[in-house]
């Protein structure tokens, strides 16, 4: 039971990449508005996105306070122009989201190869340490700061003339690999959190190849 012509939100979905976290839902409002509340399992409800006609709400500021907590959100529906109105039970209609634990569930964003440098038959490939919106002591933490050794990178590398992808792994942001002298190689990296069972992998970085701007070649 609810207010006349007011429908409850449905399909509440968390969309989160590198901790940038948005709650989405349906339907597009017709003569109604929404307010979102979020809390941890043990915490108080905090209201966000007051009386909005959007069907999404950016909850990043709340979840970055403790990314290892489990959060629950709920979306309240109110009649447009009469937000004090409540359902027959004395409360506005609302729908709960699924639980969301950012540390375990945020998608890993597409990594970027920062640079590569060849010295003889060795190539050092460096992955950009992406900044997140998670803060500590008023500074934004990088992905590596947040995940530590839980985060690894897989490097795919191959001769420009070949299709087979060799792999290397690191729990830092740097790889040192052996290459054949006189061959050009291409590189792509993937972020991985092996301890997860879902959302373990990021999409692959853009491919970077030797002989292009990002690299540096030194013959020793």
């Amino acid at each position: 039971s609810g207010t006349t012509n007011t429908v409850a939100a449905y399909n509440l979905t968390w969309k989160s990449t590198n901790f940038k976290t948005i709650l989405e839902w349906e339907p597009k409002p017709v003569n109604q508005v929404y307010t979102v509340q979020i809390s941890t399992k043990s915490g108080d409800w905090k209201s966000k996105c007051f009386y909005t006609t959007d069907t999404e709400c950016d909850l990043t500021d709340e979840i970055v306070k403790d990314v290892k907590q489990t959060y629950l959100a709920r979306v309240f529906s109110y009649p447009a122009g009469n937000v004090e109105s409540t359902g027959s039970a004395g409360e506005p209609l609302y729908e709960n989201s699924p639980e969301f634990t950012p540390y375990l569930e945020t998608n890993l964003g597409q990594p970027t190869i920062q640079s590569f440098e060849q010295v003889g038959t060795k190539v050092n490939v460096t992955v950009e340490d992406e900044r997140t919106l998670v803060r500590r002591n008023n500074t934004f933490l990088s992905l590596r700061d947040v995940f530590g050794k839980d985060l690894i990178y897989t490097l795919y590398y191959w001769k420009s003339s070949s299709s087979g992808k060799k792999t290397a792994k690191t729990n830092t942001n740097e790889f040192l690999i052996d290459v054949d002298k006189g061959e050009n190689y291409c590189f792509s990296v993937q972020a991985v959190i092996p301890s997860r069972t879902v959302n373990r992998k990021s999409t692959d970085s853009p491919v970077e190849c030797m002989g292009q701007e990002k690299g540096e070649f030194r013959e020793i």
């Epitope: 690894i152 897989t154 795919y156 299709s163 087979g164 992808k165 060799k166 792999t167 290397a168 792994k169 690191t170 729990n171 052996d178 993937q190 991985v192 092996p194 301890s195 997860r196 069972t197 879902v198 373990r200 992998k201 692959d204």
Partner: antibody
Framework: EVQLVESGGGLVQPGGSLRLSCAAS????????IHWVRQAPGKGLEWVGY????????YYADSVKGRFTISADTSKNTAYLQMNSLRAEDTAVYYC?????????????WGQGTLVTVSS | DIQMTQSPSSLSASVGDRVTITCRAS??????VAWYQQKPGKAPKLLIY???FLYSGVPSRFSGSRSGTDFTLTISSLQPEDFATYYC?????????FGQGTKVEIK
């Protein structure tokens, strides 16, 4: 429960083709890597190749390069080994195995294997 | 490709014996070495990962160690169910490679 089940093995003539399947359950193959490893009768383990089902990247042992192709269908949660131009020396039990993908752990779950016999 | 040279190729031992199998990598593989046990007609099973860590459910009589490029699998007190073939494997670089195997037989 994590499980890998190979199928498609059998007797094939030299020069012939065969496609092996590796059906996974208990995990999504797109989140991991799948390897094929073979074992000739009375011999040791020989790595054949791998696929990252998430992006389709593959790599093959020199002994099978150009003849074998690994693919995956994430909607079916199944990996495949297409074997062409088969030779007598390809006779083996073929295993698929899951690669956990960490620095520490590699092949943590294996299928029961399927026997491929190449003979005229 | 990195070669994994395993020795001995076979050994005979009695129940209760301490058994040691070694594997030497042809170049540095850090700790990216696993040990597998295989029984006739069965798939290999992971015993040791990262050179020295016991995989879940594996009895504590199995242990692994590393010294440079030399890796050792030790069974402290051989049990009847331990008679099998053991393989080392490096996964430091592509392609991953296996040792030739060590068959542990009953004396």
């Amino acid at each position: 429960e994590v499980q890998l089940v190979e199928s498609g093995g059998g007797l094939v003539q030299p020069g012939g083709s065969l496609r092996l399947s590796c059906a996974a359950s208990g995990f999504a193959i797109a989140n991991y890597w799948i390897h094929w490893v073979r074992q000739a009768p009375g011999k040791g383990l020989e790595w054949v190749g791998y696929i990252d089902p998430y992006n389709g990247y593959t790599y093959y042992a020199d002994s099978v390069k150009g003849r074998f192709t690994i693919s995956a269908d994430t909607s079916k949660n199944t990996a495949y080994l297409q074997m062409n131009s088969l030779r007598a020396e390809d006779t083996a039990v073929y295993y698929c195995a899951r690669d956990y993908g960490s620095l520490e752990v590699s092949l943590d779950y294996w299928g029961q294997g399927t026997l491929v016999t190449v003979s005229s | 490709d990195i070669q994994m040279t395993q020795s001995p190729s076979s050994l005979s031992a009695s129940v209760g014996d301490r058994v040691t199998i070694t594997c030497r990598a042809s170049q540095d593989v850090n700790t990216a070495v696993a040990w597998y046990q295989q029984k006739p007609g069965k798939a290999p099973k992971l015993l040791i990962y990262s050179a020295s860590f016991l995989y879940s459910g594996v009895p504590s009589r199995f242990s692994g160690s590393r010294s440079g490029t030399d890796f050792t699998l030790t069974i402290s007190s051989l049990q009847p169910e331990d008679f099998a073939t053991y393989y080392c494997q490096q996964h430091y670089t592509t392609p991953p490679t296996f040792g030739q195997g060590t068959k542990v037989e009953i004396k």
